[in-house]
Interface confidence: low
């Protein structure tokens, strides 16, 4: 359905409010360093132009593509070269290369100041003074720090953000009402950003086929009563939505996501019995709810998979006729029977099945060759099961903070070249798998844990890609999307690593640590732990534990002292000397 004016089409479909919000998100995700006011000006100009096209689709430039219109607008920014350097070269290109160029320059770790939360009264005053600007600022700050944030979902977050301020700024105890809500939005937002980053990495680095395979597995688990054709249709539509969002086509993405939600709700009888509540909600809530909906019950009496995929004499014929369709059916059938498996495990099984058919369908006796293919699945299933069992036991024994520390040591020894802030961030997130997943019963542990670990390890991969320092990380990140976690798990201590020179400055602490929040204090201690391991990669657990216990005691003692700064200076020197002795530095 070709439209004379794409910009008018999207403006009419989305409405002015969503149109403006999505254009702001798009611009902030591309030009992450630009001041808020500059972006608002650009958005207003685009919006005014869109309105002229709504009034007359034949008006000048209204027939231009959105990439052309938006790219032209971004390229009017006066300080492009000073602020962004070589990104300015993108403006010399034509579409679609110009957009590809902008995408290439998205920065997963932009050099932006940490967002500091003002006092509640200050925030409430700002909210009341100019609600529209306040909410736009929220979209802008999140979008520029998370350049792949799923735009239609960010609109949902903004709606909840607004609701929190509307409710809490008139509450008796504003802080008690507001702060927990903001904490929840922050944590959910970080998780949402990381999940979407994996989808975009999957599409951009491993291609549409990889993403579609992931989607077949996940949707088949979620909608096990749906027919394969129905799941295939949903996968095709979902792939289009995420391809658009990951490609910066946010207006099309939001529009198509709304269409998909509409389709799912109109056809819920043939999709899932769990959608009823979601489908009664307004659009943004509806789409979010569908994306998070629990798995439907498995149909009763599903036949054994072996009949169609091992015992049938037509296996090779069916495979040869339409390889991806046949493998898709295998993945669908396996996934709908196994909500207890992680998506990445299901994809490993499908890959093993594919490899076996590739080999066996060319053999003299194909059936004899692939007859035992399901036996090859056993070790693949047991590996994550055992790993999760061991790590949940360790988590239950240590608690989250010390479990994170164990992972910090483990991962620093595996890939010591990686920057300390990245190791701390990634290991802390890996450690959260314990409190997130170990509470679940056995049947839900693996999909929770391994699919969460895929998201966290992708953070490591995208951060490392910006400044690659470790061949081992590059190898695990690029060889196979579904084997990233087993690849990292299999890494041993890097014997080629030359320990870092000891630098006392790294272990010098000041009284400001005493005023930090518990989380910030943990991060300081964990940063020191990573640095210790980088200095002494062969240090034993016991040695590191002793040093960290001494360090915790030192911080506690000096934070209670009358003259804190003197205590940190004098006791700090003693701690460094004692640590050097303990570790033989």
């Amino acid at each position: 359905d070709a439209h004379k004016s794409e910009v008018a089409h999207r403006f009419k479909d989305l409405g002015e409010e969503n149109f403006k919000a999505l254009v702001l998100i798009a611009f902030a995700q591309y030009l992450q360093q630009c001041p808020f006011e500059d972006h608002v000006k650009l958005v207003n100009e685009v919006t005014e132009f869109a309105k002229t096209c709504v009034a007359d689709e034949s008006a000048e430039n209204c027939d231009k593509s959105l990439h052309t219109l938006f790219g032209d607008k971004l390229c009017t920014v006066a300080t492009l070269r000073e602020t962004y350097g070589e990104m300015a070269d993108c403006c010399a290109k034509q579409e679609p290369e110009r957009n590809e160029c902008f995408l290439q320059h998205k920065d997963d770790n932009p050099n932006l100041p940490r967002l500091v939360r003002p006092e509640v009264d200050v925030m409430c005053t700002a909210f009341h003074d100019n609600e529209e600007t306040f909410l736009k600022k929220y979209l802008y700050e999140i979008a520029r720090r998370h350049p792949y944030f799923y735009a239609p979902e960010l609109l949902f977050f903004a709606k909840r953000y607004k609701a929190a301020f509307t409710e809490c700024c008139q509450a008796a105890d504003k802080a008690a009402c507001l702060l927990p809500k903001l904490d929840e939005l922050r944590d959910e937002g970080k998780a949402s950003s990381a999940k979407q980053r994996l989808k975009c990495a999957s599409l951009q680095k491993f291609g549409e086929r990889a993403f579609k395979a992931w989607a077949v597995a996940r949707l088949s688990q979620r909608f096990p009563k749906a027919e394969f054709a129905e799941v295939s249709k949903l996968v095709t539509d979902l792939t289009k939505v995420h391809t658009e969002c990951c490609h910066g086509d946010l207006l099309e993405c939001a529009d198509d996501r709304a269409d998909l939600a509409k389709y799912i709700c109109e056809n819920q009888d043939s999709i899932s019995s769990k959608l009823k509540e979601c489908c009664e909600k307004p659009l943004l809530e509806k789409s979010h709810c569908i994306a998070e909906v629990e798995n439907d019950e498995m149909p009763a009496d599903l036949p054994s998979l072996a009949a169609d995929f091992v015992e049938s004499k037509d296996v090779c014929k069916n495979y040869a006729e339409a390889k991806d369709v046949f493998l898709g059916m295998f993945l669908y059938e396996y996934a709908r029977r196994h909500p207890d498996y992680s998506v990445v495990l299901l994809l490993r099984l499908a890959k093993t099945y594919e490899t076996t058919l590739e080999k066996c369908c060319a053999a003299a006796d194909p059936h004899e060759c692939y007859a035992k293919v399901f036996d090859e699945f056993k070790p693949l299933v047991e590996e994550p099961q055992n790993l999760i069992k061991q790590n949940c036991e360790l988590f239950e024994q240590l608690g989250e903070y010390k479990f994170q520390n164990a992972l910090l040591v483990r991962y620093t020894k595996k890939v010591p070249q990686v920057s300390t802030p990245t190791l701390v961030e990634v290991s802390r997130n890996l450690g959260k798998v314990g409190s997130k997943c170990c509470k679940h019963p056995e049947a839900k542990r693996m999909p929770c844990a391994e699919d969460y670990l895929s998201v966290v390890l992708n953070q490591l991969c995208v951060l490392h890609e910006k400044t690659p320092v470790s061949d081992r990380v590059t190898k695990c990140c690029t060889e196979s999307l579904v084997n990233r976690r087993p690849c990292f798990s299999a890494l041993e201590v890097d014997e080629t690593y030359v320990p870092k020179e000891f630098n006392a400055e790294t272990f010098t602490f000041h009284a400001d640590i005493c005023t930090l929040s518990e989380k910030e204090r943990q991060i300081k201690k964990q940063t020191a732990l990573v640095e210790l391991v980088k200095h002494k990669p062969k240090a034993t657990k016991e040695q590191l534990k002793a040093v960290m216990d001494d360090f915790a005691a030192f911080v506690e003692k000096c934070c209670k002292a009358d003259d804190k700064e003197t205590c940190f200076a004098e006791e700090g020197k003693k701690l460094v000397a004692a640590s050097q002795a303990a570790l033989g530095l």
């Epitope: 590809e100 290439q104 491993f206 291609g207 086929r209 060889e479």
Partner: nanobody, 116 residues
Framework: QVQLVESGGGLVQPGGSLRLSCAAS????????MSWVRQAPGKGFEWVSS????????RYSDSVKGRFTISRDNARNTLYLQMNSLKPEDTAVYYC?????????SGQGTQVTVSS
């Protein structure tokens, strides 16, 4: 260790042809989309063409459309770029890279010079 080794470049007259190859090792070649990108003297990287893992989906920049053809041989772990009707503005170092249009090259590249 991921390795991409480009070859096949050289000096050619305008209107001439060249076929570039990229030998891949250290990763599962058949599972990855691949691209060719180029860098002209004193310029940034420019995306030229991409092909998906199966080889059935190919894309080209406007500047080479109709003249260049990307292909791959998954059995040989090799990516190709057939370049016909070459122009002086095609002069550049050509690199192959893992991934789509946003891919970053990691090999040494192969020099293509189009000049009479």
């Amino acid at each position: 260790q991921v390795q991409l080794v480009e070859s096949g470049g050289g000096l050619v007259q305008p209107g001439g042809s060249l076929r570039l190859s990229c030998a891949a090792s250290g990763f599962t070649f058949r599972g990855f989309g691949m691209s060719w990108v180029r860098q002209a003297p004193g310029k940034g990287f420019e995306w030229v063409s991409s092909i998906n893992s199966g080889g059935e989906d190919t894309r080209y920049s406007d500047s080479v459309k109709g003249r260049f053809t990307i292909s791959r041989d998954n059995a040989r772990n090799t990516l190709y770029l057939q370049m016909n009707s070459l122009k002086p503005e095609d002069t550049a170092v050509y690199y192959c890279a893992i991934g789509g249009a946003g891919a970053t090259p990691s090999g040494q590249g192969t020099q293509v010079t189009v000049s009479s």
